[in-house]
Each structure stands twice: as structure tokens, then as C-alpha cells.
Amino acid sequence: EVEKTACPSGKKAPEIDESLIFYKKWELEACVDAALLATQMDRVNAIPFTYEQLDVLKHKLDELYPQGYPESVIQHLGYLFLKMSPEDIRKWNVTSLETLKALLEVNKGHEMSPQVATLIDRFVKGRGQLDKDTLDTLTAFYPGYLCSLSPEELSSVPPSSIWAVRPQDLDTCDPRQLDVLYPKARLAFQNMNGSEYFVKIQSFLGGAPTEDLKALSQQNVSMDLATFMKLRTDAVLPLTVAEVQKLLGPHVEGLKAEERHRPVRDWILRQRQDDLDTLGLGLQG
């Protein structure tokens, strides 16, 4: 808390400019008008205020807007965003994607902070669903964003948004999350032809049921082992040796290297030895 002191003569700030960086904290408090600060917030980010001086500016805005900042101020917060607590952010109503981008830019290169998580949560809830433009923006800043959501939260993602998802965005998703995302991806990509469809659906296949894997095995997709290893064990177990051979194509030889790992290990144990021998890989059931 900065003490209330009178502004020294001749130091009252007529505008927000770089001369203010040489003001002591108490001088900023006494000599900068909060309403002026709010109207000239777009200047703040270009001025090299110290982290400590930003405390004073935040204090002034908090006094001016005790119920939460208007979006006209929020979109120009810049580095001042780093001073906000999740409690501050919960008072905001952020509706513009441009505002969201501007604030995410401040945190760029760092992992998602509680402030950012709260901001995103407020923004998405305000929109009602995770639309494509929002998802595009969020995954550009945080490739792991999608996998940080619960299955319940993912259920609000419309199939149209799935087009914004890149394979790396799903790297850290667990099977429960892929169970939710896969049907949406299947719906989103349903009008694509065989090979193009497989390219798009591949990274979602950790949520695919047995019948869809059987259907893919009829399409000469040549699934790689890395994708196969991420499939649900319960979806792989019912597949026959012939179906797995068709699904993997030339990659079937990779099963030998993975024979001790799930789901390959469990699948091998379910097969007849005669059928496994047809692969010529020396797999022992």
C-alpha cells in the first residue's frame, strides 16, 4: 500500500509519458490521475516502467474500477497483466479475441500461469463454447492447452473447431480426453476421402473404437507403430492378425520390437499361435 502524499509542485503528470519512469513510487501515486491513466493505457506498455512502479499503476486502476476493469483498459494492460491475480481477473468480462491475444502475448514463452488459466476460463465461458478461432489462438500460444482440459470441458468443443487442432496439440492428451475428441474429429473430417481422412484423424485415434479400426484396416492406410501404440488396448484386442497386418501394412514388422509393450503384448496373448506365425516375425503368444 502506497501512502497518500501531496504531489510536489510542478510534478503533476499532464499525460502518461516516459518522464514518469524517474518518479518514485509515492510520486506516481500522488501525481498520476487514475482516469488519465485509464484513458492512456495504450501508452503504458511502451514505457519502461519497473516492475515495482507497475504496482502503483495497478493500485490506481483498482481504486478507479473496484468492480473490475472495462475491456477498453484490459486490452491495453500489457505488462501490467503480470501484476493481476486470478481474483482480479474473475471480475473481468473479456469478449474480444484481440484482447485475449494481447494478454497471452505478454506471457508468451512461459508456461501457463494461474492468471492465464483464469483469463482463458473466463473468456471461453463467456463465449459458451470453444470455437475454432479461440482454439486456434490458444493452441498457438499453448500447444498443450487442449490436453489441459477435462473431458467435461472438452465436450463443449464443437466438431467445427477440430479443424484448428494440430497433431502436437494432442501429444499430452490421455485416453479419456481422446475418447471425447475422437467422435468430434470423425464428424469433422467425415467428408474427406480415404487417405486425406487418415492423415487428419490419425492423431485422434487414441479414442477410436474397434469397429473404426477394423474399417480403417480395409483402406490400406499403413498406420505407423507410434500411432498403433497409442490406440486403446480394449479397441486393439478384438482385432484379428489379418486386420492388424492390413492396418499396419509395411509397418507390421515393427510389432516385434514392441512385443513386450501394451497394447501389442496384450494383443499377442489373445491370438492363436498359428495366426501369429503367418506374420513371420517370431511373435510368441
Partner: antibody, heavy 119, light 107 residues
């Protein structure tokens, strides 16, 4: 990787001026303030001032206001500091340094230029 | 201007020692303090920022502590490669100011 390259040494006569350069590479030059710091032999460091390459905006330590002038050339990603009316007190190593905003500590330092003022 | 005082210009140490270098600010600077290491003929290197955060790639034997006016850089297990000058810097207000430095030497 991020680098700030400076010439190794400058020998100048008392009363003359010298223009020191700092060539940046490995990052977007116009996105970061550039600061300059003085170090006299066996002494601590002194902050001279800073310039924003995009706007050309400058801020100086009062102590160096009449001594140093900061400029940039965006096309070559180079920052300059001109020192005028040199005396033996100006003999020092001068560093350019890139700060982390808004914390203003320096994560990248130039190689340093040794300025010797001697007749 | 805020004055950063490093009262010990020199400190004698031996390998394996626990070394504490202190820095005192002339007024409250919160946690806006950084520590740098400088070896002869080299540029300073950032070790600690915001009083206690270790910079990327800095060995964990280096730790920073303090807030307000008193700050400490501690090297928990002194190594020969740690023989250098150490400077503190405040970034609470302009002009930014540095301590005069503490030189670590072998006993």
C-alpha cells in the same frame, strides 16, 4: 543464439568523441530495449541509459545525460553510443545489454568495448 | 538514487565452502534484485533474478534470498570455477544501480 557483438577496443584522445557499436543477432532487434553500462577498471557497474530500437525513444541516467547519446540503425540491427568530450574518467569497458521486461535485469550482455582515453 | 552496498570487497574461500555474499539497498526495493557473476576479461553473466529465482542453466549450488533492503547470494559448495566477481543490481527504480562487487579468492 542471441548475441551482442562489440568491437574490442578504442583508443581516443582527450576532448575527442567516440562512437561505440553493438550489433545484435539471434532475436528481433526492434522488440527489446537496449541498455548501456559502464565499468571502470576494478570498479562496479554504472547504468548509462537505454534506447528502444523501434521508436528511437531514449532514457538516460542523469549523470550521463551530457556525456552519452544513444542511437540505432534498424536496418543493420546495430545500437550505437556516442561519448563526447572524453577525459581519463571515461576510460572504461562499455557494455550493451538486453533486459528482460518489465524486470530490467540483463540476460544478454555484449562482449564489451574497452575505451582508453590517452594523449 | 538507490545505493547498493556490497560491504565485502574481497572474500577468501576454499573449494567445498559455503559462501554468502551480501548486498544492502539504501531503501526498500522489494524483490527487484539480480545477481551477476563476472570472470576476468569476460562480460557479466546473470545468475539470480527477482532476488531468488535461478536463471536458466545456472547450477543449483547458487541461491538468492532476501527482500526489502537485505539480499544474499549463497554458493553452497564452492567450486574453483566460481572464483569471480559478483555484483548485485536493483531494478526497483531508475536509475538502475549496481553494487561495487565482491571478489572471491582462494585462501
Amino acid at each position: 543464439q542471441v548475441q551482442l557483438q562489440q568491437p574490442g577496443a578504442e583508443l581516443v584522445k582527450p576532448g575527442a568523441s567516440v562512437k561505440l557499436s553493438c550489433k545484435a543477432s539471434g532475436y528481433t532487434f526492434t522488440s527489446y530495449w537496449m541498455h548501456w553500462v559502464k565499468q571502470r577498471p576494478g570498479q562496479g557497474l554504472e547504468w548509462i541509459g537505454m534506447i528502444h530500437p523501434n521508436s528511437g525513444s531514449t532514457n538516460y541516467n542523469e549523470k550521463f545525460k551530457s556525456k552519452a547519446t544513444l542511437t540505432v540503425d534498424k536496418s543493420s540491427s546495430t545500437a550505437y553510443m556516442q561519448l563526447s568530450s572524453l577525459t581519463s574518467e571515461d576510460s572504461a569497458v562499455y557494455y550493451c545489454a538486453r533486459p528482460v521486461v518489465p524486470y530490467w535485469y540483463f540476460d544478454v550482455w555484449g562482449t564489451g568495448t574497452t575505451v582508453t582515453v590517452s594523449s | 538514487d538507490i545505493v547498493m552496498t556490497q560491504s565485502q570487497k574481497f572474500m577468501s574461500t576454499t573449494v567445498g565452502d559455503r559462501v554468502s555474499i551480501t548486498c544492502k539497498a539504501s531503501q526498500n526495493v522489494g524483490t527487484a534484485v539480480a545477481w551477476y557473476q563476472q570472470k576476468p576479461g569476460q562480460s557479466p553473466k546473470l545468475l539470480i533474478y527477482s532476488a531468488s529465482n535461478r536463471y536458466t542453466g545456472v547450477p543449483d549450488r547458487f541461491t538468492g534470498s532476501g527482500s526489502g533492503t537485505d539480499f544474499t547470494l549463497t554458493i553452497s559448495n564452492m567450486q574453483s570455477e566460481d572464483l569471480a566477481d559478483y555484483f548485485c543490481q536493483q531494478s526497483s527504480s531508475y536509475p538502475l544501480t549496481f553494487g561495487a562487487g565482491t571478489k572471491l579468492e582462494l585462501k
